[in-house]
């Protein structure tokens, strides 16, 4: 039959950052192609990435419809050159993915310090709010829109002349911190979802930004 020489996909893995979500799998195809299906636990299967020779499929458009749902995907293997025929009744080999709940499992992307402004002994540090592909009423939502107060930022700040890192935290995208007058400070931020308990609860640190460089303003 037409599927006897095909190999089922394996090592199905979700790769997701700020809700941009790709399903990856193995093996690299030899004389076969793949089609992916995705569904919620209670929903119907929807096919994506038809007869592809790739070993990944971007499922962002599907999961952003409801990021709090739990999704399951499966990858079907077909012989190369396969054409869908109404007469074929044999189900091709397939493999299921692990379940995936975007709200709980998407990784937090590296944040960026948008700006900082010093007024006397106070510095206001603003974290850039990243846009996601999640929509509400035809409007794209930011990371803050999606996570609300579940998302916090930790600011690490230190005198340029010192190694000890002070911390501040916010559940907005702004920090207002006290600094010593006449001292230059450096800043780095980290996104955190404290309610998570696994490795994806923190982002990597933002690039370090220091006073005296272009992102900052100083006013007396």
């Amino acid at each position: 039959s037409g599927t006897t020489n095909t190999v089922a996909a394996y090592n199905l893995t979700w790769k997701s950052t700020n809700f941009k979500t790709i399903l990856e799998w193995e093996p690299k195809p030899i004389n076969q192609v793949y089609t992916v299906q995705i569904s919620t636990k209670s929903g119907d299967w929807k096919s994506k990435c038809f007869y592809t020779a790739d070993t990944e499929c971007d499922l962002t458009d599907e999961i952003v419809k409801d990021v709090k749902q739990t999704y399951l995907a499966r990858v079907f293997s077909y012989p190369a050159g396969h054409v869908e025929s109404t007469g074929s009744t044999e189900e091709p080999p397939y493999e299921n993915s692990p379940e995936f709940t975007p709200y709980l499992e998407t990784n937090l992307g590296q944040p960026t310090i948008q700006s900082f402004e010093q007024v006397g002994t106070k510095v206001n540090v603003t974290v850039q709010d990243e846009w996601t592909l999640v929509r509400r009423n035809d409007t794209f939502l930011s990371l803050r829109d999606v996570f609300g107060k579940d998302l916090i930022y930790t600011l690490y700040y230190w005198k340029s002349s010192s190694s000890g890192k002070k911390t501040a935290k916010t559940n907005t995208n702004e920090f207002l911190i006290d600094v010593d007058k006449g001292e230059n400070y450096c800043f780095s931020v980290q996104a955190v979802i404290p309610s998570r308990r696994t490795a994806n609860r923190k982002s990597t640190d933002s690039p370090v930004e220091c006073m005296g460089h272009e992102k900052g303003e100083s006013r007396e």
């Epitope: 916090i152 890192k165 911390t167 501040a168 935290k169 780095s188 404290p194």
Partner: antibody, heavy 120, light 107 residues
């Protein structure tokens, strides 16, 4: 079950060194912040310092700065407090504690403590 | 550094009494205040976080409140197991600082 277990305390002479360990189980230290807090006999709680194992960032209380160093080994899920140039006033029970890194950052889990006595 | 001034340093009370402990921060700390209970020879245990939120597993007789830079821990009806020392702590900024402690003793 989340657990922190300190070890390495003991009697040391003034000027000596000691390394305390804080072994974590039930969670990954790499995605939390770990603090060291001490309590001198009959006294209150004094914060010593912290480490964020994800980036190695640390900060120390003025009373220990330059003498104490906090480090972490994420592969062993353990944080350390290296104490050098010890003084009599460093005598205390030393606790490690986990910071949940929420906005208010309470220390939600503490170890049982290990006693360090600095005396000749 | 932010100072946390806790009062009283000790108090005597009876089972069933309502007990109030206060902490005053030397500057604004928003709601970043926690309360801990410590019994002799044991590690502190978290009771209240974010000034007024009861930590998981803590009896509802414990409560916390905030008024500006003043923070209060209230035990509505003191139980025998509540005799201990209580500490407030701010973690609004580094370094986090503790109050001096309040020892609650049996009258």
């Amino acid at each position: 079950e989340v657990q922190l277990v300190e070890s390495g305390g003991g009697l040391v002479q003034p000027g000596g060194s000691l390394r305390l360990a804080c072994a974590a189980s039930g969670f990954t230290i790499g995605v939390y912040i770990i603090h060291w807090v001490r309590q001198a006999p009959g006294k209150g709680l004094e914060w010593v310092g912290y480490i964020d194992p994800s980036n190695g960032y640390t900060y120390y209380a003025d009373s220990v700065k330059g003498r104490f160093t906090i480090s972490a080994d994420t592969s062993k899920n353990t944080a350390y407090l290296q104490m050098n140039s010890l003084r009599a006033e460093d005598t205390a029970v030393y606790y490690c504690a986990r910071d949940d890194q929420s906005v208010s950052s309470p220390f939600d889990y503490w170890g049982q403590g290990t006693l360090v006595t600095v005396s000749s | 550094d932010i100072q946390m001034t806790q009062s009283p340093s000790s108090l005597s009370a009876s089972v069933g009494d309502r007990v109030t402990i206060t902490c005053r921060a030397s500057q604004d700390v928003n709601t970043a205040v926690a309360w801990y209970q410590q019994k002799p020879g044991k590690a502190p245990k978290l009771l209240i976080y974010s000034a007024s939120f009861l930590y998981s597993g803590v009896p509802s007789r414990f409560s916390g409140s905030r008024s500006g830079t003043d923070f209060t821990l209230t035990i509505s009806s003191l139980q025998p197991e509540d005799f201990a020392t209580y500490y407030c702590q701010q973690h609004y900024t580094t370094p986090p600082t503790f109050g001096q402690g309040t020892k609650v003793e049996i009258k």
